[in-house]
């Protein structure tokens, strides 16, 4: 039985240049982890595997940072950032579990962060 | 010298789910830093990654054909699986499975001979 | 996705004659592409890593040339084991192949 929960920066927004921190927590859960994939729509990110680390996409290499922790850093923010980014836990025994961020980058410099929230 | 084979149904069908394994011989499945993955190719079409699998069980998909796929190993028998269900005859395929040096942002180097599955009723 | 577009469909040329085989990305792959050769009822043969790099055992004749999103596998001499198909795959991101290019005997 899946008990756990993911905790993410829920909807946030950051200014058209600037850098974002997407960040989620897996909790009330005792499973190890053993793999986080960031994915966005259809492309994917990064990997963070509990034996090899980090990989990074290549064609996220110049701006796209490893955490903290087991988030994800995404610099030079453009306005084709803006979308839906997944965290996606994998973990034994319970399996997989899902967070997802929605980021919406503006021309402004008024760049509020939204509440968080939790996905069961 | 590594090598994978294929097994599964030649025939499967429609709404159905689509199960295949691949054996791994020469090698561990879980003594390297490799995914394993799975890639089809339809009657005389190009080529489609599916998606691969890391020996401790994490995987990456196809953002296409992710609602449909699971893909599990075994290294107690160093194979891993596909399954794919709800399939359709436009999951006719030819289906391979090869070791993915994801971690070394190089292709897929090794590949099984492939095997052929039909969806019809 | 990045989407990989192959051209031409299909080259007829004879034994002896240059091949030349293009590969377009829908955007930057920086120099992560392989090129397949794939003949009927086999599996695909890894030629070419990274852009320009040959794989072990693939004869000096295939090479692979550019980066970024246009790329090129040149077979400077055909022989008559190169008629087949070859397909592109990028690394970039998730894995996607080209439509592939048919070498055919004229």
């Known amino acids: 039985m899946m008990t756990g929960t993911i905790e993410t920066t829920g909807n946030i927004s950051a200014e058209k240049g600037g850098s974002i921190i997407l960040q989620c927590h897996l909790s009330s859960t005792t499973a190890q982890v053993t793999q986080v994939n960031w994915e966005q729509q259809d492309q994917l990110l990064a990997i963070c595997n509990a034996d090899l680390g980090w990989h990074i996409s290549p064609s996220f290499k110049d701006r796209v940072a490893p955490g903290p922790g087991l988030g994800l850093t995404l610099q030079s923010l453009t306005v084709n950032d803006t979308g839906e980014y997944f965290c996606i836990y994998h973990t034994y025994p319970d399996g997989t579990y899902t967070g997802r961020i929605f980021l919406e980058v503006l021309e402004s410099s008024v760049a509020e962060h939204g509440a968080r929230f939790q996905i069961p | 010298q590594l090598q994978l084979q294929e097994s599964g149904p030649g025939l499967v069908k429609p709404s159905e789910t689509l199960s295949l394994t691949c054996t791994v011989s020469g090698g561990s499945i879980s003594s390297s830093s490799y995914y394993w993955g799975w890639i089809r190719q339809p009657p005389g079409k190009g080529l489609e990654w599916i998606g691969s699998?890391?020996?401790?069980?994490?995987?990456y998909y196809n953002p296409s054909l992710k609602s449909r796929v699971t893909i599990s190993v075994d290294t107690s028998k160093n194979q891993f699986s596909l399954k794919l269900s709800s399939v359709t005859a436009a999951d006719t395929a030819v289906y391979y499975c090869a070791r993915d040096p994801l971690y070394q942002d190089a292709p897929f180097d090794y590949w099984g001979q492939g095997t052929l599955v039909t969806v019809s009723s | 996705e990045i989407v990989l577009t192959q051209s031409p469909a299909t080259l007829s040329l004879s034994p002896g004659e240059r091949a030349t085989l293009s590969c377009r990305a829908s955007q930057s792959v920086s120099s992560y592409l392989a090129w397949y050769q794939q003949k009927p009822g086999q599996a695909p043969r890894l030629l070419i890593y990274d852009a320009s790099n040959r794989a072990t055992g693939i004869p000096a004749r295939f090479s692979g040339s550019g980066s970024g999103t246009d790329f090129t596998l040149t077979i400077s001499s055909l022989e008559p084991e190169d008629f087949a198909v070859y397909y592109c795959q990028q690394r970039a991101n998730f894995p996607t192949f080209g439509g592939g290019t048919k070498v055919e005997i004229k």
């Open positions: 699998i890391y020996y401790s069980g994490s995987t």
